[in-house]
Amino acid sequence: CEDEELEHLRLLEPHCFPLSLVPTEFCPSPPALKDGFVQDEGTMFPVGKNVVYTCNEGYSLIGNPVARCGEDLRWLVGEMHCQKIACVLPVLMDGIQSHPQKPFYTVGEKVTVSCSGGMSLEGPSAFLCGSSLKWSPEMKNARCVQKENPLTQAVPKCQRWEKLQNSRCVCKMPYECGPSLDVCAQDERSKRILPLTVCKMHVLHCQGRNYTLTGRDSCTLPASAEKACGACPLWGKCDAESSKCVCREASECEEEGFSICVEVNGKEQTMSECEAGALRCRGQSISVTSIRPCAAETQ
């Protein structure tokens, strides 16, 4: 019989129940569970009564969810806790609005933040719920500041891997990259090594994805097939006779692309993608050591 049925029988047929079976002593309310609660909690907890715990949304119960009211009127509770399975938004600074607004976010979900009227955002605008259930980049880095007078307010200067959207800089989509220098990179999460480009690595970093440069022999880069004139890379130019792309001289670089750190003949130096591509195109062995300018030169 269920507890409710027994109670009902007790009322209808009290002679069937010896007095010793009528509970006169009860356990107190079951102990609280951090980030969780007792399902269908009643008000009376006689000896032998079981209760089942469950976790709040965004949390998963680890351990035995059942607790029992013991003979000594104490709860017999096994080892259990609620483990976070999602990112939750921290308390955001005044004026910051998040989109989409949800109680929790699963790994891989993205949140964008913006400022309410009259304020402008300082710091990153997009955050990713990482596999460690932490936001990347950290949300505390975003804050709202008073906008300058609209007459003097300049259009924000976006980085090359960003674009202007709703008067603020947001990460580009990878397909918006255009021609860029091929590199090999390791996905920090899966540890797989993949062919990328300098621009796509910047975009992935911008969107909170972690990739690290690896040697160019560690993956299969796209073959530098002879391209028709309409699709020359930054470091290529059109040869009128053959209607094919040929290598530029580094000194001929026009639209330069990103500034990157390259090791040439054992020495690190900052150069443009175009210059690096021109050297590689002409058969020189170069190694991209950073998708940003070399550290020593930026200090």
Epitope: M173, P174, Y175
Partner: antibody, heavy 115, light 107 residues
Framework: EVQLQQSGPELVKPGASVKMSCKAS????????MHWVKQSHGKSLEWIGY????????SYNQNFKGKATLTVNKSSSTAYMELRSLTSEDSAVYYC????????WGQGTTLTVSS | DIQMTQSPASLSASVGETVTITCRAS??????LAWYQQKQGKSPQLLVY???TLADGVPSRFSGSGSGTQYSLKINSLQPEDFGSYYC?????????FGAGTKLELK
């Protein structure tokens, strides 16, 4: 609310050109790329290219280079696609769609190429 | 160019059932994948982007998953309004390409 209003159906002869329009409203026109997509009758979707309304820079699918030309008029928040040297293969519904993935789609312009 | 291979081409199911549509990319697209729904005579509508994020207003019975080159769209407890065609599309590099589509029909 984002809305993309496309021009009406077109019936044209082989060899001719056609220019269809897509008027955007409900958002800042320069904020989002405008993509164009072809859907032949009963078939899947084929990406033609996109244009960045900020700088007017287009990016084309190689299969449509020489066939399609994408332009924008920022003052009227309108994107245009011109298709030239038309053949019966070009008969299809053409969609404009704005956003990153893209997110929002117009109702489509039906192009029929027939003699 | 990255090719998208979508399966099945067609699918019959009843209201209340759960269905899964899959999409395979010919190269790693790093989760830059979208799913669209298209009803007869209408424009496609964005359902999912970044492989698993639901677009605004999309019911929670839809869910996207996958990584690398393999992705899927799952629809739990099919509703009458869910029948139509579904397309996957990557936005990792140009040209953006779509899968051939899956026609979901009422059994």
């Amino acid at each position: 609310e984002v809305q993309l209003q496309q021009s009406g159906p077109e019936l044209v002869k082989p060899g001719a050109s056609v220019k269809m329009s897509c008027k955007a409203s409900g958002y800042t026109f320069t904020d989002y790329n405008m993509h164009w997509v072809k859907q032949s009758h009963g078939k899947s979707l084929e990406w033609i290219g996109y244009i960045n309304p900020n700088n007017g820079g287009p990016s084309y699918n190689q299969n449509f280079k020489g066939k399609a030309t994408l332009t924008v008029n920022k003052s009227s928040s309108t994107a245009y696609m011109e298709l030239r040297s038309l053949t019966s293969e070009d008969s299809a519904v053409y969609y404009c769609a704005c956003g990153n993935y893209p997110d929002y789609w117009g109702q489509g312009t039906t192009l029929t190429v027939s003699s | 160019d990255i090719q998208m291979t979508q399966s099945p081409a067609s699918l019959s199911a009843s209201v209340g059932e759960t269905v899964t549509i899959t999409c395979r990319a010919s190269g790693n697209i790093h989760n830059y994948l979208a799913w669209y729904q298209q009803k007869q005579g209408k424009s496609p509508q964005l359902l999912v982007y970044n492989a698993k994020t639901l677009a605004d207003g999309v019911p929670s019975r839809f869910s996207g998953s996958g990584s690398g080159t393999q992705y899927s769209l799952k629809i739990n407890s099919l509703q009458p309004e869910d029948f139509g065609s579904y397309y996957c599309q990557h936005f990792w590099s140009t040209p953006l390409t779509f899968g051939a589509g899956t026609k979901l029909e009422l059994k």
